[in-house]
């Protein structure tokens, strides 16, 4: 059930996954929606008692999809938009006055105004958000300074009240970046740069989509199921570098590499993975096991189960003849399978719930 | 591979599950061994730089069963005994001099010595550990005071250096408690007291074993698979009360209730669950899927896979005729299935790895 309204002075008790910092409850709701497991959240507004908790956005999960409500001044709670049918976007053009969003300040320069500062952030590969000191800022040497910032999660590590500054986010997710969009996927290629994370994926296209939606992934290397070292098969390495480009390209069979599409205007979806993977089993945390007629029905079942992230459909010879099989609904901490097996006859795939989270824009 | 030795001035990087406090590295290793997912740990000794981290025991997990080693003064790292064949016990008779183990002080009284204080803790249903102020304690009115303590986890919430006190643990796990051992399981009974946790279990005996090894569970109620409310079927409610006894007993069909066996001397195992559960599927996080010959082979496979906690064996008619089937190796955050399904034809069970963790003692 889709619940859009926010509950003021209400705290959802328990179910904590993680805490991030957001400038307001609305942005917290979007962060929750894009998080692989978040179904509910509580945001601590400035009116809350403990100032050390201001702007904290507590992401929550619950097997029952609900949590006990507790009265708490300044708490704002609500549900993710995962349960909602409408198209979504991570694009956030808002400018936040008198807020300093904290992160790693890796670049400081003078700009005319906040808009120019936001453009600079949008056109810098590493920038997640910025803080701009206006011309009224008390300390003269900091006036008109545009600080570009990044963090390991893409979200501020903290937010504090600070007079005469404004803050905002990169508009890459609004498809407004002028950075180069590189769509090539390079076969027999390994990029030898910093791994920031690794996930399991069935193919290089899924790996690229995961890289695109990871806050710090600029390029990737994917090891196919034929890769010699078993523990690396179907492994998607998410990578970055200081320059934003891979420093070294190594020729290796059964590996493919490519770039994040975060700077691209997409004519194709980059968030949802709609293909079926044949003779492939996705392993993960089991949500349920149900009997269905065919793998499409299994994908539908997964898409309609709010906590389902991916599935495996399996049918023995005898049940196959009856047009029936078993649908294993699954999830994981990051939305990707924990392991992929081949040759067991399963048909696997992902929820289509994420398709509504793609930007609808023209090809760049 | 069983690694008993501890690595001094070594910190295992990453893989953190949770942090508890233990008086030394040896006790940290035992805590790790009994934790459902911990495979490695790092303990911060008094020689470590940051005094706020002293006595912290960081429990860790890793898919590869190893983590990168980093040099760090005062860190002591090692592996759980899960990988080891020898019999284990949680019994810890050590007395720790000049250490105050912190928790909820719920009972303070005068005792002759630390031994009498430890006996008092062992014979109190709620007591996890104690701190005793010796006759040399600076503050005269606190001398010879025995403080009984408990926490939500059973482990201290902190440990600090304090001259002229000694601390130690309850000896219930040494089978030295004189508290009543109540072995009855009451059919058609619900105990209506505080729920401290809930887990999924296939029957009341498994529920009782889980209660027995939960630090705060004194009694339990188990809802069978025939319980009318679907969401409560196979649910094991772990309970406590101030008196240590259930306050209210309600007659309800399809429910069973009983007591923790923490005060009993066992002739039967209370940690491991060796039965097979027929026509039953255990759901959880999948570790691997392998082809085996029969459900006993599946249990063996689970027992030898260090991270496996439970399994489901499944065979279609055609594979059953060949004496073969599929073995799904699984785990979860607490060692119990996340859901149990009936009527799908699977055979499920638990790892036998935990059998070596039972106390070997005579019947009380």
């Amino acid at each position: 059930e889709c619940v859009i309204k926010l509950f003021s002075d209400i705290y959802f008790q328990g179910g904590d996954i993680t805490t991030v910092y957001t400038p307001n409850a609305k942005h917290c709701q979007v962060v929750c929606t894009y998080h692989p497991r978040c179904l509910l959240f509580t945001f601590m507004a400035e009116s809350s008692v403990d100032s050390t908790k201001w702007f904290s956005c507590i992401l929550k999960d619950s097997v029952t999809e609900s949590l006990p409500k507790v009265n708490m001044t300044g708490a704002i709670s609500g549900y993710s938009f995962k349960q909602c049918p409408h198209q979504l976007s991570a694009c956030n053009k808002d400018i936040y006055v008198d807020l300093d969003m904290q992160g790693m300040n890796y670049n400081g320069s003078v700009t005319k105004n906040a808009q120019e500062c936001q453009e600079r952030c949008t056109n810098d590969a590493h920038c997640h958000f910025f803080t701009y000191a206006t011309r009224q800022f008390p300390s003269a040497e900091h006036r008109n300074i545009c600080l570009l910032k990044y963090t390991q999660t893409g979200a501020p590590t903290g937010i504090r009240k600070l007079k005469k500054v404004v803050s905002g986010f990169s508009l890459k997710s609004c498809a407004l970046s002028n950075l180069a969009c590189i769509r090539d996927i390079f076969p027999s290629t390994v990029f030898a740069d910093n791994n920031i994370d690794s996930v399991v994926a069935p193919d290089a296209l899924v790996c690229r989509r995961i890289c695109t939606h990871h806050p710090n992934c600029l390029f990737f290397t994917f090891f196919s199921q034929e890769w010699p070292k078993e523990s690396h098969r179907n492994l998607c390495l998410l990578k970055t570098s200081e320059s934003g480009l891979p420093s070294t390209r190594i020729h290796k069979n059964q590996a493919l590499s490519g770039f994040s599409l975060q700077n691209c205007r997409h004519s194709i979806p980059v968030f949802c993975h709609s293909s079926f993977y044949y003779d492939t089993d996705f392993l993960g945390e089991e949500l349920d096991i149900v009997d269905v007629k065919g793998h499409e029905a299994c994908q539908k079942m997964c898409t309609s189960a709010i906590r389902c992230q991916f599935f495996t459909y399996s049918s023995s010879q005898e049940s196959h003849n009856k047009g029936k099989g078993t649908c294993y609904l699954k999830l994981s901490s990051n939305g990707s399978p924990t392991k992929i097996l081949h040759g067991r006859g399963g048909i696997s795939g992902y929820t289509l719930r994420l398709c509504k989270m793609d930007n609808v824009c023209t090809t760049k | 591979e069983c690694v008993i030795k501890l690595f001094s001035d070594i910190y295992f990087q990453g893989g953190d599950i949770t942090t508890v406090y233990t008086p030394n590295a040896k006790h940290c290793q035992v805590v790790c061994t009994y934790h459902p997912r911990c495979l490695l740990f790092t303990f911060m000794a008094e020689s470590s730089v940051d005094s706020t981290k002293w006595f912290s025991c960081i429990l860790k997990d890793s898919v590869t069963e190893s983590l990168p080693k980093v040099n760090m003064t005062g860190a002591i790292s090692g592996y759980s005994f899960k990988q080891c064949p020898h019999q284990l016990s949680a019994c810890n008779k050590d007395i720790y001099v000049d250490l105050d183990m912190q928790g909820m002080n719920y009972n303070g009284s005068v005792t002759k010595n630390a031994q009498e204080c430890q006996e008092r803790c062992t014979n109190d249903a709620h007591c996890h550990f104690f701190t005793y102020a010796t006759r040399q304690f600076p503050s005269a009115e606190h001398r010879n005071i025995c403080l009984l303590k408990y926490t939500q986890t059973g482990a201290p919430t902190g440990i600090r250096k304090l001259k002229k006190v000694v601390s130690g643990f309850s000896l219930k796990s040494c089978a030295l408690s004189n508290l009543a051992c109540i072995r009855d399981i009451f059919p058609s009974t619900v105990f209506a007291d505080n729920n401290i946790d809930s887990v999924v279990a296939p029957d009341a005996l498994v529920c009782r074993r889980i209660c027995t090894h939960h630090p705060n569970c004194l009694f339990f109620t188990f809802f069978s698979q025939e319980w009318p409310k679907e969401s409560h079927r196979n649910l094991c409610l772990l309970k406590t009360s101030e008196s240590g006894l259930p306050s209210t007993r309600i007659h309800k069909n399809q429910a069973l209730s009983g007591f923790s066996l923490q005060n009993c001397r066992h002739s039967i195992p209370v940690f491991c669950h060796s039965s097979f559960y027929y026509d039953t599927d255990f759901l959880g996080e999948e570790l691997d899927i392998v082809d085996v010959k029969g459900h006993e082979a599946c249990q063996k496979m689970c027992t030898s896979a260090i991270r496996c906690q439970f399994f489901t064996y499944s065979s279609s008619q055609e594979s059953h005729n060949k004496g073969k089937g599929t073995c799904y190796l699984k785990l979860s955050s607490n060692g119990s299935p996340t859901k149990i399904l009936h009527g799908r034809g699977g055979i499920s069970g638990y790892t036998l790895r935990l059998c070596k963790m039972d106390n070997v003692c005579t019947t009380k």
């Epitope: - | 004189n178 508290l179 009543a180 109540i182 009855d184 008196s243 006894l245 259930p246």
Partner: nanobody, 124 residues
């Protein structure tokens, strides 16, 4: 006002039997431990037998195992101690006690409510 009242004491020859009763008012035996204790002149009070009324788990001192039986009648809120094969060393004042927490069943220090006692004399 909690009251435990013992009855059934008296004099008996060695090898004989007695049945002690303990009736409670203001306190329900249901879901609680009830114990029988005894104190001989010049000796410390010791646990004889105890029962946990929910389900009727019973506990006995080694010295009386096989000779004494503790039982309950929840409808009458009464606990009994059937004493067979009595010996001279069983001579003592017998007390009934009620606990309100999970206790070591034969440890008198942990029982909250006590009766006045009834004297049992066994002559050889």
């Amino acid at each position: 006002q909690v009251q435990l009242v013992e009855s059934g004491g008296g004099s008996v020859q060695a090898g004989g039997s007695l049945r002690l009763s303990c009736a409670a008012s203001g306190y329900t035996f249901n879901n609680n431990f009830v114990g029988w204790f005894r104190q001989a002149p010049g000796k410390e009070r010791e646990g004889v037998a105890a029962i946990y009324s929910l389900g009727g788990s019973t506990y006995y001192a080694d010295s009386v195992k096989g000779r004494f039986t503790i039982s309950q009648d929840n409808s009458k809120n009464t606990v009994y101690l059937q004493m067979n094969s009595l010996r001279a060393e069983d001579t003592a004042v017998y007390y009934c006690a009620g606990a309100i927490t999970w206790v070591p069943p034969l440890s008198h220090r942990r029982y909250t409510y006590w009766g006045q006692g009834t004297l049992v004399t066994v002559s050889s």
